[in-house]
């Protein structure tokens, strides 16, 4: 059974709840306050606030906490006053600002083009597995299937245009059913949020940080969990979406319109297709079960062809075999007949880096994700400091009052709305939910905007990339029109059930409240954040593929099981919140349970060991590479160490010292603190050498 | 250029069999079909079968299946025909022709051998 | 088997003159016939391909059309070495089968 976060020892209390954890607490936890007692004792303790039902994390043993850590955190100015400065000092301030604006916007820059290259290098590595998936005969009888595919292969190519294109190709040639298609559209919904997600990692540096940034990029994916949970169900019954649609598709005569307008890759695309170019039609073709495609590569090696339609004799087992009777002959020994075939002819090479490598597609793919990865962090990394740097006083305060503040009464309630519009419209000026979502996740992450407002940015991005999809199918071929159309359609009524389901009713929105637990759990527990990517976005899909692969009989023997267990616990967890009067002693609370199934503490212990082992030849690297780099200026103090490392030299020699959060993921000393040992530190620490 | 060449006349008896030439040069012997048609005054031309010398298959025109056979040596680039239990009705001008590539129209003709069936 | 009627035996022109020769099939052939010209004591020689394309060598005078059923192979004007039996062969299928020919004569 997956770990649970701390259940035990809380004491209901419905009227308050406590929806922090560990990380920046001011001080350290009162020892006094606890009582000496093993987890499996039932004896009465100290009270703490426990979180409602509907939250993921209640931790044992917390103090409460007298911040709030969702409360957005003052960046206080440290510099001198304008009015202070003289000239001299005024122009320089002036000339700092504009160079601190050239370089977000430089960063911001390399930032989107890494994402860019992340999902060509996810496609390298994926893109023709991720076809495979698609040519499985079963999607047209299994929703579920189709879902799950549509989240791998959106993960795995980090696109869902990528994979909503398929999709439509494959409607458009018959070889797959728009009903058979929504599920999978549903599934690219879901994928594509994975992106922002991996952008919050990037920011794990920083537990308070962190916190902000993971719950504000997982609040796109409980979003789309929700939404399909509620909504396929509910299509799988009635078809609404496809009626609709089709309705929509019927009564309209829609006549071929112009692409979509792409205003952001105008921008990035002169870099991108220096780094890499790739040729998608071979994932579609792979999933039309075209042969040929398996072998050809990602990597487009010609960008300038001569394609010439010409008609060629070609030889046929019989006349049955002819095009016509009338383009049918024979040698006098074979039939020939004629036919219409594309001659292409290469005439100039593309100029990117791999194109006379002739690397494999995973090799390629292994270096681009690799370097992405890295751009992208080191990108993160300048942008977050840039922004701290210049949101501070009250640049700071303007900037979050205009963001987070609502419209005065009785209007309060259109903010959100306007919120909702403004990420569609940015959405769509960027042409990427992913990109757009990715931007917004180290703004929530550094405190500028609120979860609660980027909720409503998130769910308008959703819209935007439909109204794109939308703009895109009207411009498709004549064939392709009416099924890409119907299933940009499908896309856009689907994310606008979510929004009526998830938005609109302040106490309907779950994924706020959701994301904030996870963030909690992220926070004190920094690899759970991994683990959460791995299982939801990965094994769970996974899973149901191969059991849905195994056959329905096998789906519904493992599935009902789970989903019957899941339902027991949420019903139990909702009585020990709401009224555990109701249930008997043993079950007002987990400790009926094993340790290591009701806390993350014993799994903590397990992943501290792999990573701490993992951490000491970090930092004895990052040491050596220092004192190498100080010895080439000759400077001694012209950059440190990783702080990190001498915290963990320290709390391995016993030492009771603050410990700061790692680049990487919590060692033997965070999972002390998580035990109370050690009080927690706020403060960041730069793991870069600067 | 191309030629065909054929020997100009066959005198058999009856019963008896009659195995004609065509010999080829002036082009890859091996690329294109060799046709064989049968010329009586009156029954005008008669497609007898062809023979792909690259690699052997033939085609037989229902009427001269069983007694024609086409062979084809590469090593010479020579085409064979063989017509076996002669009659009187054999009595004609048989010619090799070169099929054009990819169809069946005959662009150079051998000048034709005549077989005369007595006895 | 494909039948290819020539409905004239013999036709008789003038040096100069233009000359229509006919050829009919007994079903669809499409464009898959061929029309040759055989002068007396010598091998046919291929004159059109694909019912309208002229052999390498072969003069302008020689046209050929038609598609389907009918054909005809047209000599513009007639010269005194035109004289010869023309015939059309078919290679829609096999077996290949040719007109019985068409003798054209000096008035």
């Known amino acids: 059974m997956a770990p649970w976060p701390e259940l035990g020892d809380a004491q209901p209390n419905p009227d308050k709840y406590l929806e922090g954890a560990a990380g920046q607490q001011p001080t350290a936890p009162d020892k006094s306050k606890e009582t000496n007692k093993t987890d499996n004792t039932e004896a009465p303790v100290t009270k703490i606030e426990l979180l409602p039902s509907y939250s993921t994390a209640t931790l044992i043993d917390e103090p409460t906490e007298v911040d709030d850590p969702w409360n957005l955190p003052t960046l206080q100015d440290s510099g001198i006053k304008w009015s202070e400065r003289d000239t001299k000092g005024k122009i320089l301030c002036f000339f700092q600002g504009i160079g601190r604006l050239i370089l977000l916007l430089g960063f911001l820059y390399f930032f989107v083009c890494s994402l860019d290259i992340l999902s060509s290098a996810f496609q390298l590595v994926g893109g023709k597995m991720a076809g495979q998936f698609f040519s499985n005969s079963s999607i047209m009888s299994n929703p579920l299937l189709g879902l799950v595919i549509g989240v791998l292969v959106t993960v795995l190519v980090q696109s869902s245009s990528t994979s909503t294109s398929i999709v439509v190709s494959m409607v458009s040639s018959s070889l797959l059913t728009v009903r058979a298609a929504i599920p999978i559209i549903m599934g690219a919904n879901i994928g594509t949020s994975i992106t922002n997600t991996i952008v919050a990692l990037m920011q794990v540096g920083d537990r308070s940080e962190f916190r902000r940034a993971f719950a504000g990029a997982t609040v796109h994916d409980f979003f789309n969990w929700l939404s399909v949970l509620v909504l396929l169900p509910v299509e799988v019954a009635t078809h609404y979406l496809e009626i609709i649609t089709q309705l929509i598709v019927e009564s309209f005569h829609f006549k071929n319109g112009e692409d979509a307008p792409d205003l952001l890759k105008v921008i990035t695309k002169p870099f991108t297709k220096l780094i890499v170019q790739l040729d998608k039609k071979v994932i579609s073709q792979i999933a039309m079960n075209d042969e040929k495609a398996k072998n050809k590569s990602l990597v487009k090696i010609w960008c300038k062809t001569f394609t010439n339609k010409t008609q060629i004799n070609v030889t046929v087992p019989s006349t049955a075999n002819c095009t016509s009777p009338s383009l049918c002959w024979t040698d006098g020994i074979q039939n020939w007949t004629m036919k219409n075939v594309t001659y292409k002819e290469n005439i100039a090479k593309c100029q990117h880096i791999f194109v006379n490598f002739h690397l494999p597609d995973l090799a390629v793919g292994t270096i681009l994700l690799i370097l992405s990865l890295l751009v992208l962090c080191g990108c993160l990394i300048m942008i977050v400091k840039i922004l701290g740097s210049v949101l501070k006083g009250q640049v700071a305060t303007v900037i979050k009052k205009t963001i987070n503040t609502d419209f005065p009464f009785p209007f309060a309630w259109l903010t959100g709305y306007l919120a909702i519009l403004v990420g569609a419209g940015m959405t769509f000026i960027v042409q990427s939910s992913s990109v757009f979502t990715s931007a917004l996740t180290p703004l929530i992450g550094i405190g500028v905007i609120t979860i609660e407002r980027a909720y409503p940015l998130t769910l308008g991005s959703n819209i935007g990339t439909t109204t794109t999809a939308i703009l895109a199918a009207l411009a498709s071929p004549g064939n392709a029109l009416r099924s890409s159309l119907q299933i940009a359609l499908c896309h856009f009524f689907f994310n606008i059930s979510g929004i009526l389901l998830w938005y609109p009713i302040p106490f309907t929105r779950l994924p706020i409240r959701m994301a904030k637990g996870l963030g909690n759990i992220s926070a004190k527990y920094r690899w759970f954040a991994v683990f959460y990517l791995i299982i939801f976005f990965f094994l769970i899909p996974l899973t149901v593929f191969g059991l849905s692969l195994a056959g329905w009989r096998v789906l519904v023997g493992v599935g009902v099981p789970v989903v019957f267990i899941i339902i027991l616990v949420l019903c139990l967890r909702l009585l020990q919140s709401r009224c555990p009067r109701v249930l008997p002693k043993k079950l007002q609370n987990w400790n009926f349970l094993p340790l290591w199934m009701r806390s993350l503490k014993p799994w903590d212990a397990v992943v501290s060991k792999f990573t701490g082992c993992f951490q000491m030849r970090c930092c004895c690297c990052c040491r050596v590479c220092c004192r190498a780099c100080c010895l080439l200026c000759d400077c001694p103090k012209c950059c440190r160490c990783s702080k990190c490392c001498e915290d963990l030299e320290e709390a391995q020699e016993g030492q009771d010292v603050p410990v700061k959060a790692p680049e990487t993921f919590d060692n033997i000393t965070i999972s002390r603190e998580a035990q109370g040992e050690v009080p927690a530190s706020d403060s960041k620490t730069e793991c870069t050498a600067l | 250029q191309v030629q065909l060449q054929q020997p100009g006349a066959e005198l058999v008896k009856p019963g008896a069999s009659v195995k004609m030439s065509c010999k080829t040069s002036g082009y890859t012997f091996t690329t294109n079909n060799m046709h064989w048609v049968k010329q009586t005054p009156g029954q005008g031309l008669e497609w007898i079968g062809a023979?792909?010398?690259?690699?052997?298959?033939?085609a037989y025109n229902q009427k001269f299946k069983g007694k024609a056979t086409l062979t084809a040596d590469k090593s010479s680039s020579t085409a064979y025909m063989q017509l076996s239990s002669l009659t009187s009705e054999a009595s004609a001008v048989y010619y090799c022709?070169?099929?054009?590539?990819?169809?069946?129209?005959?662009?150079?003709w051998g000048q034709g051998t005549s077989v005369i069936v007595s006895s | 088997d494909i039948v290819m009627t020539q409905s004239h035996k013999f036709m008789s022109r003038s040096v100069g003159d233009r000359v229509r020769i006919t050829c009919k099939a007994s079903?669809?052939?499409?464009?898959?016939v061929a029309w040759y010209q055989q002068k007396p004591g010598q091998s046919p020689k291929l004159l059109i391909y694909w019912a309208t394309t002229r052999h390498s060598g072969v003069p302008d005078r020689f046209t050929g059309s038609g598609s389907g059923t009918d054909f005809i192979f047209t000599i513009s004007n007639v010269q005194s070495e035109d004289l010869a039996d023309y015939f059309c062969q078919q290679y829609s299928s096999n077996p290949l089968t040719f007109g019985a020919g068409t003798k054209l004569e000096l008035k």
């Open positions: 022709a070169r099929g054009m590539y990819g169809h069946g129209a005959m662009d150079y």
């Open positions: 079903q669809d052939v499409g464009t898959a």
């Open positions: 023979i792909y010398p690259g690699n052997g298959a033939t």
